[in-house]
Amino acid sequence: TQNKALPENVKYGIVLDAGSSHTSLYIYKWPAEKENDTGVVHQVEECRVKGPGISKFVQKVNEIGIYLTDCMERAREVIPRSQHQETPVYLGATAGMRLLRMESEELADRVLDVVERSLSNYPFDFQGARIITGQEEGAYGWITINYLLGKFSQKTRWFSIVPYETNNQETFGALDLGGASTQVTFVPQNQTIESPDNALQFRLYGKDYNVYTHSFLCYGKDQALWQKLAKDIQVASNEILRDPCFHPGYKKVVNVSDLYKTPCTKRFEMTLPFQQFEIQGIGNYQQCHQSILELFNTSYCPYSQCAFNGIFLPPLQGDFGAFSAFYFVMKFLNLTSEKVSQEKVTEMMKKFCAQPWEEIKTSYAGVKEKYLSEYCFSGTYILSLLLQGYHFTADSWEHIHFIGKIQGSDAGWTLGYMLNLTNMIPAEQPLSTPLSHSTYV
């Protein structure tokens, strides 16, 4: 009964995206004999782990094993048993864990250690859990979308296999929005990348790419909201915060201790004469937009051009895929269509934010109130970040494509991460018979 002598002609890989707000497990599949071809890996399953991000388990690490169980069991069901021991498992933690590490390296290590022990208990080829850098997160997201769009393939096609594909080989830029950070990654046009920290050089499938990337820690949608609240409560006359980023009639009590728990609000921290305050929504897009802009320091730039906070940003070039929370938020707001102009998006946001909270709750009865309440802020934040933060204009807005999936695979960093770690993106263009290769991303 030695099944190992007859391996299946497909392979699988598992990547867990341990984000700041939740963890998702992705299962990928590809034909074994075509490992070096571009575009052959596809996602067969996504399993969202029930509960918060792993950084929230810092005081209850013993619960991490149970937390991961359902999705790991799902992986055991989806992947044929004969493949389990050969299936690599990778966990990458992003900005939520970067923030925890900033607070305490020891606590971050403890969480990762328990995660590693839990995942190694499964019959897969566990390859480790680590906190990926913001630069990696940006780079792997860029690799993912361009791999799925067929941009690395040297064969020009007369037909389009994906809706965003133009037949040229010009890569798409990647815009990724998470809960705790946001990444912008693209190939600038004949532009020197003035800051070495933001420069990446790749050789993929025989072609060189000079890529710009930056990850803005604390500028994911959840941490940006905490920042905005911490900034605005500084000037509140009492424990009532009238907030234009929430619908009229919305009320929520916030603990000051929760507000100052994250390193992202440290710059706004002050001693307040109260332990709690109440957010009272007033639903005004323009005021919300103005408040958000105060989070972006645009007064200082040591380069020819900056995004914000003194971070170099070359002139925008080409088309961009905007994914993760960029997509989820805009999809909820029904603003992902290619035909919707930036002016139209702004108009829709003005109307949406002005809608009374009771009306919103009735219209979206199936949506959890915690998420529902934050779409006005999140939508406004996305516009502010893209327009004022990254300098998109009404004209260049049409180059932003809000992407959830490409060819059935989620846009995000996980596929690029796995392609790199499994050595499936060769530096040189493979011949029809795959060559042995030594240089990878």
């Epitope: 009964t1 030695q2 099944n3 190992k4 048993r81 004969s82 389990h84 021991q85 190694s120 208990n121 019959p123 080829d125 566990f126």
Partner: antibody, heavy 121, light 107 residues
Framework: EVQLVESGGGLVKPGGSLRLSCAAS????????MNWVRQSPGKGLEWVAE??????????HYAESVKGRFTISRDDSKNTVYLQMNSLKTEDTAVYYC????????????WGQGTTVTVSS | EIVLTQSPATLSLSPGERATLSCRAS??????LHWYQQKPGQAPRLLIY???QSISGIPARFSGSGSGTDFTLTISSLEPEDFAVYYC?????????FGGGTKLEIK
């Protein structure tokens, strides 16, 4: 012929140490997870430890009853798996079997003949 | 950890009779349940894996069934050499655990 041969058992005092060896032949040893299972006199079977492959960074797992006292290791160049037993207790007295699974995982289709460990003062 | 309870502890039957051995898991383990036979002075021998998969070289009279928490090993017509101790084993998750065993003796 697929074979596992254990050695190293014997009589040892409580608190003492012993190292068991298991020599494998007839299969590609480096490709398979290896395990130790024990059986106390007149009792049932108890899984003791597992060691995975080089590609799995030689990951190990242990039964709670031996954790911190026993160490499983392997030498792929010698086709041998070891069980280092420290701080031995009388309840560790058992026949120790070296086992593996040549098909899939977490069951045992190949067993050694066993080696007896007696812990007694 | 997953606890496996085997019943009966002892089963007395005559050659030619049908034997039904039971194994119950403390939580669902899908079909990750394996059966072994052990004779005195010998190492255990795998009979059935993944609840119902038969092993080459094992007589067809041995069959397994069940899924989730309840599993059965059936020997359709007992032969004299079948009288031994039978163990079930959790192959679902670590730590790997065995049932307490069922001793099948000649009546």
């Amino acid at each position: 012929e697929v074979q596992l041969v254990e050695s190293g058992g014997g009589l040892v005092k409580p608190g003492g140490s012993l190292r068991l060896s298991c020599a494998a032949s007839g299969f590609t040893f480096s490709k398979y997870w290896m395990n130790w299972v024990r059986q106390s006199p007149g009792k049932g079977l108890e899984w003791v430890a597992e060691i995975r492959l080089k590609s799995n960074k030689y990951g190990t797992h242990y039964a709670e009853s031996v954790k911190g006292r026993f160490t499983i290791s392997r030498d792929d160049s010698k086709n041998t798996v070891y069980l280092q037993m420290n701080s031995l207790k009388t309840e560790d007295t058992a026949v120790y079997y070296c086992t593996t699974q040549l098909d899939l995982y977490w069951f045992f289709d190949v067993w050694g003949q066993g080696t007896t460990v007696t812990v007694s003062s | 950890e997953i606890v496996l309870t085997q019943s009966p502890a002892t089963l007395s039957l005559s050659p030619g009779e049908r034997a039904t051995l039971s194994c119950r898991a403390s939580q669902s383990i899908s079909d990750y349940l394996h059966w072994y036979q052990q004779k005195p002075g010998q190492a255990p021998r795998l009979l059935i894996y993944y609840a119902s998969q038969s092993i080459s070289g094992i007589p067809a009279r041995f069959s397994g069934s069940g899924s989730g928490t309840d599993f059965t090993l059936t020997i359709s017509s007992l032969e004299p050499e079948d009288f031994a101790v039978y163990y079930c084993q959790n192959g679902h998750s670590l730590p790997l655990t065995f049932g307490g065993g069922t001793k099948l003796e000649i009546k």
